[in-house]
Protein backbone atom coordinates (compact mmCIF):
# COMPACT_ATOMS: atom_id res chain seq x y z
CA UNK A 1 0.00 0.00 0.00
CA UNK A 2 1.13 3.54 -0.74
CA UNK A 3 1.45 5.98 2.12
CA UNK A 4 0.18 9.48 1.40
CA UNK A 5 2.20 11.98 3.37
CA UNK A 6 2.41 15.72 3.44
CA UNK A 7 5.99 16.92 3.44
CA UNK A 8 6.85 20.22 5.02
CA UNK A 9 9.90 22.10 3.79
CA UNK A 10 11.13 25.19 5.58
CA UNK A 11 13.39 27.69 3.83
CA UNK A 12 14.77 31.17 4.17
CA UNK A 13 14.10 33.78 1.52
CA UNK A 14 16.44 33.51 -1.45
CA UNK A 15 16.92 29.76 -1.23
CA UNK A 16 15.92 27.21 -3.86
CA UNK A 17 13.36 24.45 -3.52
CA UNK A 18 14.23 21.40 -5.60
CA UNK A 19 11.92 18.41 -5.53
CA UNK A 20 10.84 15.53 -7.72
CA UNK A 21 7.55 13.81 -8.44
CA UNK A 22 7.47 10.28 -9.76
CA UNK A 23 4.78 8.79 -11.95
CA UNK A 24 3.92 5.54 -13.67
CA UNK A 25 5.86 5.50 -16.93
CA UNK A 26 3.43 3.33 -18.82
CA UNK A 27 0.50 5.59 -17.93
CA UNK A 28 1.87 9.09 -17.95
CA UNK A 29 5.12 9.30 -19.89
CA UNK A 30 3.46 11.31 -22.66
CA UNK A 31 1.11 13.32 -20.47
CA UNK A 32 1.59 16.94 -19.54
CA UNK A 33 2.61 17.58 -15.97
CA UNK A 34 1.96 20.66 -13.91
CA UNK A 35 3.07 22.27 -10.67
CA UNK A 36 0.22 23.83 -8.78
CA UNK A 37 -0.37 25.75 -5.59
CA UNK A 38 -3.48 25.21 -3.51
CA UNK A 39 -5.17 28.55 -2.92
CA UNK A 40 -8.24 27.96 -0.82
CA UNK A 41 -10.07 25.07 -2.45
CA UNK A 42 -8.97 26.03 -5.93
CA UNK A 43 -5.58 24.90 -7.20
CA UNK A 44 -3.63 27.42 -9.24
CA UNK A 45 -1.48 26.04 -12.06
CA UNK A 46 1.90 27.78 -11.88
CA UNK A 47 3.71 25.95 -14.67
CA UNK A 48 3.10 23.02 -16.97
CA UNK A 49 5.17 20.96 -19.37
CA UNK A 50 4.71 20.88 -23.13
CA UNK A 51 2.80 18.14 -24.92
CA UNK A 52 4.12 15.62 -25.56
CA UNK A 53 6.80 15.80 -22.91
CA UNK A 54 10.33 15.73 -24.24
CA UNK A 55 13.36 14.56 -22.36
CA UNK A 56 15.57 17.32 -21.01
CA UNK A 57 13.46 20.13 -22.37
CA UNK A 58 12.98 22.40 -19.35
CA UNK A 59 10.00 24.71 -19.12
CA UNK A 60 10.65 27.93 -17.23
CA UNK A 61 7.91 30.19 -15.92
CA UNK A 62 9.40 32.99 -13.90
CA UNK A 63 11.27 31.44 -10.96
CA UNK A 64 9.86 27.97 -11.60
CA UNK A 65 11.55 25.39 -13.81
CA UNK A 66 9.96 22.06 -14.67
CA UNK A 67 11.96 19.33 -16.34
CA UNK A 68 10.20 16.12 -17.26
CA UNK A 69 12.10 12.88 -17.71
CA UNK A 70 9.48 10.64 -19.34
CA UNK A 71 12.11 7.95 -19.88
CA UNK A 72 12.62 7.85 -16.11
CA UNK A 73 9.13 8.62 -14.87
CA UNK A 74 10.22 11.72 -13.00
CA UNK A 75 9.36 15.41 -12.98
CA UNK A 76 11.97 17.76 -11.53
CA UNK A 77 10.71 21.01 -10.00
CA UNK A 78 12.89 23.99 -9.08
CA UNK A 79 11.66 27.17 -7.45
CA UNK A 80 14.45 29.72 -7.09
CA UNK A 81 14.78 32.87 -5.00
CA UNK A 82 12.00 31.83 -2.64
CA UNK A 83 9.89 34.55 -1.06
CA UNK A 84 7.72 34.54 2.06
CA UNK A 85 4.61 34.79 -0.11
CA UNK A 86 5.57 31.51 -1.82
CA UNK A 87 4.58 29.69 1.38
CA UNK A 88 1.73 27.26 0.86
CA UNK A 89 0.73 23.80 -0.27
CA UNK A 90 2.02 22.58 -3.64
CA UNK A 91 1.33 19.51 -5.76
CA UNK A 92 2.57 17.88 -8.91
CA UNK A 93 -0.31 16.83 -11.15
CA UNK A 94 -0.86 15.06 -14.41
CA UNK A 95 -2.46 17.87 -16.37
CA UNK A 96 -5.31 16.50 -18.46
CA UNK A 97 -7.67 19.44 -18.53
CA UNK A 98 -7.90 22.66 -16.47
CA UNK A 99 -10.73 21.11 -14.47
CA UNK A 100 -9.43 17.56 -14.41
CA UNK A 101 -6.01 16.70 -13.05
CA UNK A 102 -4.55 13.59 -11.47
CA UNK A 103 -2.61 14.46 -8.33
CA UNK A 104 0.74 12.76 -7.91
CA UNK A 105 1.91 11.65 -4.48
CA UNK A 106 2.99 13.74 -1.54
CA UNK A 107 1.84 17.34 -1.48
CA UNK A 108 4.60 19.73 -0.47
CA UNK A 109 3.96 22.21 2.33
CA UNK A 110 6.41 25.03 1.74
CA UNK A 111 7.20 27.52 4.50
CA UNK A 112 9.45 30.43 3.61
CA UNK A 113 10.59 32.81 6.31
CA UNK A 114 12.68 35.96 6.34
CA UNK A 115 16.37 35.62 7.09
CA UNK A 116 17.61 36.55 10.58
CA UNK A 117 18.14 40.26 11.13
CA UNK A 118 21.65 41.30 10.26
CA UNK A 119 22.17 38.27 8.05
CA UNK A 120 22.16 38.78 4.29
CA UNK A 121 19.79 36.53 2.39
CA UNK A 122 21.15 33.48 0.65
CA UNK A 123 22.02 33.80 -3.01
CA UNK A 124 19.53 32.65 -5.61
CA UNK A 125 21.30 29.35 -6.17
CA UNK A 126 21.24 28.45 -2.52
CA UNK A 127 19.66 25.06 -2.23
CA UNK A 128 18.18 23.34 0.73
CA UNK A 129 18.92 19.68 1.00
CA UNK A 130 16.89 16.99 2.69
CA UNK A 131 19.40 14.63 4.17
CA UNK A 132 20.21 12.38 7.07
CA UNK A 133 23.02 11.71 9.49
CA UNK A 134 23.37 10.25 12.98
CA UNK A 135 21.56 12.33 15.54
CA UNK A 136 23.37 14.57 17.98
CA UNK A 137 20.61 16.89 19.09
CA UNK A 138 17.07 17.58 18.01
CA UNK A 139 16.57 20.95 19.65
CA UNK A 140 16.56 22.97 16.46
CA UNK A 141 13.25 21.71 15.15
CA UNK A 142 11.34 22.03 18.39
CA UNK A 143 8.47 19.95 19.75
CA UNK A 144 6.19 20.35 16.75
CA UNK A 145 8.28 18.01 14.63
CA UNK A 146 6.17 14.98 13.72
CA UNK A 147 7.92 12.64 11.37
CA UNK A 148 8.46 8.96 10.88
CA UNK A 149 11.92 9.59 9.56
CA UNK A 150 14.67 12.00 10.41
CA UNK A 151 15.64 14.88 12.58
CA UNK A 152 18.66 16.89 13.67
CA UNK A 153 19.93 20.27 14.55
CA UNK A 154 20.12 21.96 11.19
CA UNK A 155 22.76 24.52 10.28
CA UNK A 156 21.83 28.11 11.13
CA UNK A 157 18.91 29.55 9.20
CA UNK A 158 17.75 26.37 7.53
CA UNK A 159 15.51 23.50 8.50
CA UNK A 160 13.39 20.89 6.85
CA UNK A 161 10.42 19.22 8.40
CA UNK A 162 8.81 16.18 6.86
CA UNK A 163 5.52 15.43 8.54
CA UNK A 164 3.03 12.64 8.31
CA UNK A 165 -0.33 13.56 9.79
CA UNK A 166 -1.34 11.34 12.66
CA UNK A 167 2.05 9.80 13.24
CA UNK A 168 3.59 11.80 16.04
CA UNK A 169 6.94 10.53 17.17
CA UNK A 170 8.82 11.56 20.26
CA UNK A 171 12.01 13.35 19.30
CA UNK A 172 14.05 11.17 21.61
CA UNK A 173 13.09 8.14 19.53
CA UNK A 174 14.29 9.57 16.23
CA UNK A 175 17.57 8.13 15.05
CA UNK A 176 17.98 9.55 11.56
CA UNK A 177 18.42 13.12 10.46
CA UNK A 178 17.49 15.84 8.09
CA UNK A 179 20.48 18.01 7.32
CA UNK A 180 20.10 21.24 5.43
CA UNK A 181 23.37 22.70 4.23
CA UNK A 182 23.13 26.22 2.85
CA UNK A 183 25.22 27.23 -0.14
CA UNK A 184 26.60 30.74 -0.07
Amino acid sequence: TTELTEEKYEYKEGQTLEVKCDYALEKYANSRKAWQKMEGKMPKILAKTERPSENSHPVQVGRITLEDYPDHGLLQVRMTNLQVEDSGLYQCVIYQHPKESHVLFNPICLVVTKGSSGTPGSSENSTQNVYRTPSTTAKALGPRYTSPRTVTQAPPESTVVVSTPGSEINLTNVTDIIRVPVFN
Partner: antibody, heavy 122, light 107 residues
Framework: QVQLVQSGAEVKKPGASVKVSCKAS????????INWVRQATGQGLEWMGW????????GSVQKFRGRVTMTRNTSIHIAYMELSSLRSEDTAVYYC???????????????WGRGTLVTVSS | DIQMTQSPSSLSASVGDRVNITCQAS??????LNWYQQKPGKAPNLLIY???NLETGVPSRFSGSGSGTAFTFTISSLQPEDIATYYC?????????FGQGTRLEIK
Amino acid sequence: QVQLVQSGAEVKKPGASVKVSCKASGYTFTRYDINWVRQATGQGLEWMGWMNPNSGNSGSVQKFRGRVTMTRNTSIHIAYMELSSLRSEDTAVYYCARGGYTSSWRWYFDLWGRGTLVTVSS
Amino acid sequence: DIQMTQSPSSLSASVGDRVNITCQASQDIRKHLNWYQQKPGKAPNLLIYDAANLETGVPSRFSGSGSGTAFTFTISSLQPEDIATYYCQHYANLPITFGQGTRLEIK
Protein backbone atom coordinates in the same frame (compact mmCIF):
# COMPACT_ATOMS: atom_id res chain seq x y z
CA GLN B 1 21.28 -1.29 12.42
CA VAL B 2 20.80 0.67 9.20
CA GLN B 3 21.81 -1.60 6.33
CA LEU B 4 21.04 -3.06 2.92
CA VAL B 5 21.63 -6.79 2.57
CA GLN B 6 21.84 -8.26 -0.93
CA SER B 7 21.31 -11.75 -2.24
CA GLY B 8 24.21 -14.03 -3.15
CA ALA B 9 26.27 -14.43 -6.30
CA GLU B 10 24.65 -15.83 -9.43
CA VAL B 11 25.94 -17.59 -12.52
CA LYS B 12 23.68 -17.35 -15.56
CA LYS B 13 23.73 -18.38 -19.19
CA PRO B 14 23.37 -15.83 -22.00
CA GLY B 15 19.71 -15.07 -22.68
CA ALA B 16 18.62 -15.93 -19.13
CA SER B 17 17.34 -13.55 -16.45
CA VAL B 18 18.64 -12.76 -12.98
CA LYS B 19 16.75 -11.30 -10.02
CA VAL B 20 18.81 -9.62 -7.31
CA SER B 21 17.24 -8.76 -3.96
CA CYS B 22 18.09 -6.01 -1.50
CA LYS B 23 16.68 -6.12 2.03
CA ALA B 24 16.53 -2.85 3.94
CA SER B 25 16.57 -2.59 7.71
CA GLY B 26 17.01 0.06 10.37
CA TYR B 27 15.12 2.83 8.57
CA THR B 28 11.73 3.49 7.01
CA PHE B 29 11.97 1.62 3.72
CA THR B 30 9.23 3.56 1.92
CA ARG B 31 10.73 6.97 2.56
CA TYR B 32 13.94 6.74 0.56
CA ASP B 33 14.56 5.83 -3.06
CA ILE B 34 16.42 2.65 -3.88
CA ASN B 35 18.94 2.93 -6.71
CA TRP B 36 20.82 0.24 -8.60
CA VAL B 37 24.41 0.73 -9.66
CA ARG B 38 26.60 -1.83 -11.40
CA GLN B 39 30.34 -2.23 -11.78
CA ALA B 40 32.07 -4.54 -14.22
CA THR B 41 35.37 -5.99 -13.03
CA GLY B 42 38.07 -3.32 -13.02
CA GLN B 43 35.62 -0.74 -14.37
CA GLY B 44 33.81 2.29 -13.00
CA LEU B 45 30.35 2.76 -11.52
CA GLU B 46 27.28 2.81 -13.75
CA TRP B 47 23.89 4.01 -12.51
CA MET B 48 21.11 1.76 -13.78
CA GLY B 49 18.00 3.36 -12.35
CA TRP B 50 15.85 4.11 -9.33
CA MET B 51 12.68 3.01 -7.59
CA ASN B 52 10.38 4.75 -5.15
CA PRO B 53 9.47 1.98 -2.68
CA ASN B 54 6.37 3.88 -1.59
CA SER B 55 4.68 4.34 -4.97
CA GLY B 56 6.43 1.45 -6.68
CA ASN B 57 7.30 3.69 -9.63
CA SER B 58 10.71 3.24 -11.17
CA GLY B 59 12.85 4.33 -14.07
CA SER B 60 16.03 3.20 -15.75
CA VAL B 61 18.64 4.54 -18.12
CA GLN B 62 18.15 4.07 -21.85
CA LYS B 63 20.59 1.19 -22.29
CA PHE B 64 18.67 -1.02 -19.84
CA ARG B 65 15.17 -0.05 -20.90
CA GLY B 66 13.03 -3.05 -21.64
CA ARG B 67 15.49 -5.39 -19.96
CA VAL B 68 15.39 -4.20 -16.36
CA THR B 69 12.48 -4.40 -13.93
CA MET B 70 12.60 -2.89 -10.46
CA THR B 71 10.01 -4.00 -7.94
CA ARG B 72 9.57 -4.17 -4.18
CA ASN B 73 7.73 -5.89 -1.37
CA THR B 74 7.03 -3.24 1.24
CA SER B 75 5.81 -5.72 3.85
CA ILE B 76 9.23 -7.34 4.06
CA HIS B 77 11.29 -4.28 3.05
CA ILE B 78 12.89 -5.85 0.01
CA ALA B 79 13.70 -4.24 -3.34
CA TYR B 80 14.33 -6.37 -6.41
CA MET B 81 16.15 -5.74 -9.66
CA GLU B 82 15.56 -8.19 -12.49
CA LEU B 83 17.71 -8.05 -15.61
CA SER B 84 16.66 -10.17 -18.59
CA SER B 85 18.21 -11.23 -21.89
CA LEU B 86 21.59 -11.43 -20.20
CA ARG B 87 24.76 -11.17 -22.22
CA SER B 88 28.40 -11.59 -21.30
CA GLU B 89 28.90 -7.83 -20.93
CA ASP B 90 26.34 -7.86 -18.09
CA THR B 91 28.87 -9.69 -15.94
CA ALA B 92 29.34 -7.27 -13.04
CA VAL B 93 28.78 -6.59 -9.38
CA TYR B 94 25.29 -5.14 -8.89
CA TYR B 95 24.79 -2.80 -5.95
CA CYS B 96 21.62 -1.46 -4.41
CA ALA B 97 22.04 1.95 -2.80
CA ARG B 98 19.74 4.15 -0.77
CA GLY B 99 19.09 7.52 -2.35
CA GLY B 100 17.53 10.65 -0.96
CA TYR B 101 14.07 11.19 0.44
CA THR B 102 11.52 10.16 -2.18
CA SER B 103 10.26 13.69 -2.92
CA SER B 104 13.60 15.46 -2.84
CA TRP B 105 15.90 16.00 -5.80
CA ARG B 106 18.74 14.59 -3.76
CA TRP B 107 20.65 11.77 -5.34
CA TYR B 108 23.23 10.95 -2.67
CA PHE B 109 23.90 7.27 -2.24
CA ASP B 110 24.65 7.16 1.46
CA LEU B 111 23.95 3.50 2.17
CA TRP B 112 25.07 0.61 -0.05
CA GLY B 113 24.59 -3.11 -0.14
CA ARG B 114 27.73 -5.24 -0.36
CA GLY B 115 27.01 -6.06 -3.98
CA THR B 116 25.92 -9.16 -5.87
CA LEU B 117 28.25 -10.65 -8.42
CA VAL B 118 26.39 -11.79 -11.54
CA THR B 119 28.44 -13.84 -13.98
CA VAL B 120 27.06 -14.46 -17.45
CA SER B 121 28.82 -17.31 -19.17
CA SER B 122 27.94 -20.13 -21.54
CA ASP C 1 24.01 13.04 -20.90
CA ILE C 2 26.45 14.96 -18.75
CA GLN C 3 30.00 13.65 -18.96
CA MET C 4 32.11 13.69 -15.82
CA THR C 5 35.86 13.71 -16.46
CA GLN C 6 38.15 12.95 -13.56
CA SER C 7 41.85 13.62 -13.47
CA PRO C 8 44.26 12.16 -12.95
CA SER C 9 43.10 8.60 -13.63
CA SER C 10 45.69 7.36 -11.16
CA LEU C 11 48.19 8.91 -8.83
CA SER C 12 50.83 7.90 -6.34
CA ALA C 13 51.59 9.98 -3.26
CA SER C 14 53.38 9.69 0.05
CA VAL C 15 51.83 9.53 3.50
CA GLY C 16 51.27 13.08 4.71
CA ASP C 17 51.02 14.55 1.21
CA ARG C 18 48.22 16.82 0.12
CA VAL C 19 46.29 15.16 -2.70
CA ASN C 20 43.94 16.84 -5.19
CA ILE C 21 41.59 15.13 -7.62
CA THR C 22 39.57 17.16 -10.11
CA CYS C 23 36.26 16.47 -11.75
CA GLN C 24 35.07 18.39 -14.80
CA ALA C 25 31.41 18.38 -15.85
CA SER C 26 30.48 18.79 -19.51
CA GLN C 27 27.86 21.37 -18.51
CA ASP C 28 26.84 23.43 -15.50
CA ILE C 29 25.73 21.19 -12.63
CA ARG C 30 25.63 23.93 -9.98
CA LYS C 31 26.72 22.16 -6.77
CA HIS C 32 25.05 18.85 -7.54
CA LEU C 33 28.18 16.77 -7.14
CA ASN C 34 29.13 13.99 -4.73
CA TRP C 35 32.40 12.17 -4.03
CA TYR C 36 32.78 8.49 -3.10
CA GLN C 37 35.63 6.31 -1.92
CA GLN C 38 35.78 2.67 -2.96
CA LYS C 39 38.26 0.28 -1.44
CA PRO C 40 39.11 -2.97 -3.26
CA GLY C 41 36.35 -5.55 -2.96
CA LYS C 42 34.04 -3.15 -1.11
CA ALA C 43 31.02 -1.03 -1.94
CA PRO C 44 31.52 2.71 -2.49
CA ASN C 45 31.27 5.01 0.51
CA LEU C 46 29.87 8.56 0.37
CA LEU C 47 32.45 11.12 1.52
CA ILE C 48 31.29 14.51 0.22
CA TYR C 49 27.84 15.58 -0.95
CA ASP C 50 26.77 18.76 -2.72
CA ALA C 51 30.34 19.57 -3.70
CA ALA C 52 31.58 20.62 -0.27
CA ASN C 53 29.63 19.00 2.57
CA LEU C 54 31.39 16.33 4.59
CA GLU C 55 29.29 13.25 5.25
CA THR C 56 28.89 12.38 8.91
CA GLY C 57 31.67 10.20 10.27
CA VAL C 58 34.08 11.03 7.46
CA PRO C 59 37.49 12.33 8.64
CA SER C 60 38.02 16.06 8.27
CA ARG C 61 41.14 15.58 6.13
CA PHE C 62 38.71 15.03 3.24
CA SER C 63 37.17 18.10 1.64
CA GLY C 64 35.53 19.22 -1.57
CA SER C 65 35.08 22.49 -3.42
CA GLY C 66 33.81 23.92 -6.67
CA SER C 67 30.60 24.69 -8.50
CA GLY C 68 29.38 24.91 -12.06
CA THR C 69 31.67 22.69 -14.11
CA ALA C 70 34.91 22.48 -12.09
CA PHE C 71 35.25 20.56 -8.83
CA THR C 72 38.13 19.52 -6.61
CA PHE C 73 38.41 16.77 -4.01
CA THR C 74 41.24 17.15 -1.51
CA ILE C 75 42.92 14.94 1.07
CA SER C 76 44.89 17.34 3.24
CA SER C 77 47.25 14.75 4.69
CA LEU C 78 47.26 11.34 3.03
CA GLN C 79 46.95 8.33 5.33
CA PRO C 80 47.72 4.68 4.48
CA GLU C 81 44.04 3.75 4.80
CA ASP C 82 43.16 6.22 2.03
CA ILE C 83 44.36 3.78 -0.64
CA ALA C 84 41.24 3.46 -2.80
CA THR C 85 39.56 4.57 -5.98
CA TYR C 86 37.66 7.86 -5.79
CA TYR C 87 34.62 8.72 -7.90
CA CYS C 88 32.68 11.90 -8.52
CA GLN C 89 28.96 11.73 -9.36
CA HIS C 90 26.58 14.41 -10.57
CA TYR C 91 22.83 14.64 -10.15
CA ALA C 92 21.95 17.93 -11.83
CA ASN C 93 19.72 16.05 -14.25
CA LEU C 94 19.12 12.53 -15.47
CA PRO C 95 20.75 10.21 -16.12
CA ILE C 96 23.07 10.33 -13.15
CA THR C 97 26.64 9.69 -14.21
CA PHE C 98 29.92 9.00 -12.43
CA GLY C 99 33.44 10.01 -13.28
CA GLN C 100 35.69 7.20 -14.47
CA GLY C 101 37.50 7.09 -11.14
CA THR C 102 40.91 8.03 -9.77
CA ARG C 103 43.04 5.26 -8.36
CA LEU C 104 45.15 6.44 -5.45
CA GLU C 105 48.25 4.56 -4.34
CA ILE C 106 50.82 5.13 -1.62
CA LYS C 107 54.43 5.65 -2.73
